[in-house]
């Protein structure tokens, strides 16, 4: 039988290459059985993950999975960094892997690189 533990489906060492000024939705896919857990986002500062308070978040429901979404409206250069979602379930905390946002500041980029270029060379995105 299938596990009824909460599971957070963010891949280890995943990343997103995005542009400052664009809107972006960071999704935390959540699998649960009966009761939807409370989920939060935090941003890594060294080894500490600082909870993101007062940010626009929402839920999206699909057939086998729910998504807890952190909205960037728009993306700022300071949004560069690593994020983690956590679920509070039966008084236990389940943490996802972290996922990294590489933010390109279009003001400092001579021309907007293609997604393929960014995807294959993420080191271009460190500003």
């Amino acid at each position: 039988k299938e596990s009824c533990d909460v599971q957070l489906y963010i891949k280890r060492q995943s990343y997103h290459s995005i542009f400052a000024g664009d809107p972006f939705k960071l999704e935390c896919p959540v699998k649960y059985c009966a009761h939807r857990p409370q989920v939060t986002w935090c941003k890594l500062n060294g080894t500490t993950c600082v909870k993101l308070e007062g940010r626009h978040t929402s839920w999206k429901q699909e057939k086998n999975l729910s998504f807890f979404i952190l909205h960037f409206e728009p993306v700022l250069p300071s949004d560069n960094g690593s994020y983690r979602c956590s679920a509070n379930f039966l008084s236990a905390i389940i943490e996802s892997h972290s996922t990294t946002l590489y933010v390109t500041d279009v003001k400092s980029a001579s021309e907007r690189p293609s997604k393929d270029e960014m995807a294959s060379r993420p080191w271009l995105l460190y500003s």
């Epitope: 489906y9 891949k11 280890r12 892997h97 972290s98 294959s120």
Partner: antibody, heavy 119, light 112 residues
């Protein structure tokens, strides 16, 4: 169970481009990372790079100096490797492999395909 | 790049006897999530590699319990409690913590 099948030409001319495809079954590749490793005859293993098929984002071994391109086609449940400007030193068995991107719960390698670079 | 150094490179064994392979990394493989992404692969003659051990000590499904992995940080060991004929081949450690992923040179397990 998860299985991989590599395909592509076994012989490539020097300065040409090596092209291989890796078809997965038993898993939806969007939930995985797929990667390529090569093994020159009688030698050890060398990691070429990997792709997240969910979004197409890649990581490469810098020693391939931008010669390698890994792509994925979610609709066909397969990944591809292209290696340009090949020389005899690129003669090797090329393996594709796939692993669970979330919990490392599986890691499966293909049977490998020998690619010889020769005129 | 992280350099993975295995020893010995050749390991003659008597069937039924134990065997041990060492793997050292040039940097710690402890990731920021508190886990250590060190894997062991087995490559039998003429076959593709298969993962035996992941996260230092977790056995893959179908791997006999005579195989065990241990270690932390930069120092790791694969042990076979009693070597069987089907265990002969080359064993590789490799790290999945840092990019690019890197492999040890391989240890050839052969009959004495």
């Amino acid at each position: 169970q998860v299985q991989l099948q590599e395909s592509g030409p076994g012989l490539v001319k020097p300065s040409g481009t090596l092209s291989l495809t890796c078809a997965a079954s038993g898993v939806n590749i969007k939930d995985t990372y797929m990667y390529w490793v090569r093994q020159p005859p009688g030698k050890g293993l060398e990691w070429i790079g990997r792709i997240d098929p969910a979004n197409g984002y890649t990581r490469y071994n810098p020693s391939f100096k931008s010669r390698a391109t890994i792509s994925a086609d979610k609709s066909k449940n397969q990944a591809s490797l292209k290696l340009s400007s090949v020389t005899a030193a690129d003669t090797a068995v090329y393996y594709c492999a796939v692993y669970d991107g979330y919990y490392e719960s599986f890691d499966v390698w293909g049977q490998g395909t020998l690619v010889t670079v020769s005129s | 790049d992280v350099v993975m150094t295995q020893s010995p490179l050749s390991l003659p064994v008597t069937l039924g006897q134990p065997a041990s392979i060492s793997c050292r990394s040039s940097q710690s493989l402890l990731d920021s999530d508190g886990k250590t992404y060190l894997n062991w692969l087995q490559q039998r003659p003429g076959q593709s590699p298969r993962r035996l051990i992941y996260l230092v000590s977790k056995r893959d499904s179908g791997v006999p319990d005579r195989f065990s992995g241990s270690g932390s940080g930069t120092d790791f060991t694969l042990k076979i409690s009693r070597v069987e004929a089907e265990d002969l081949g080359v064993y590789y450690c490799w790290q999945g913590t840092l990019f690019p992923r890197t492999f040890g040179q391989g240890t050839k397990l052969e009959i004495k």
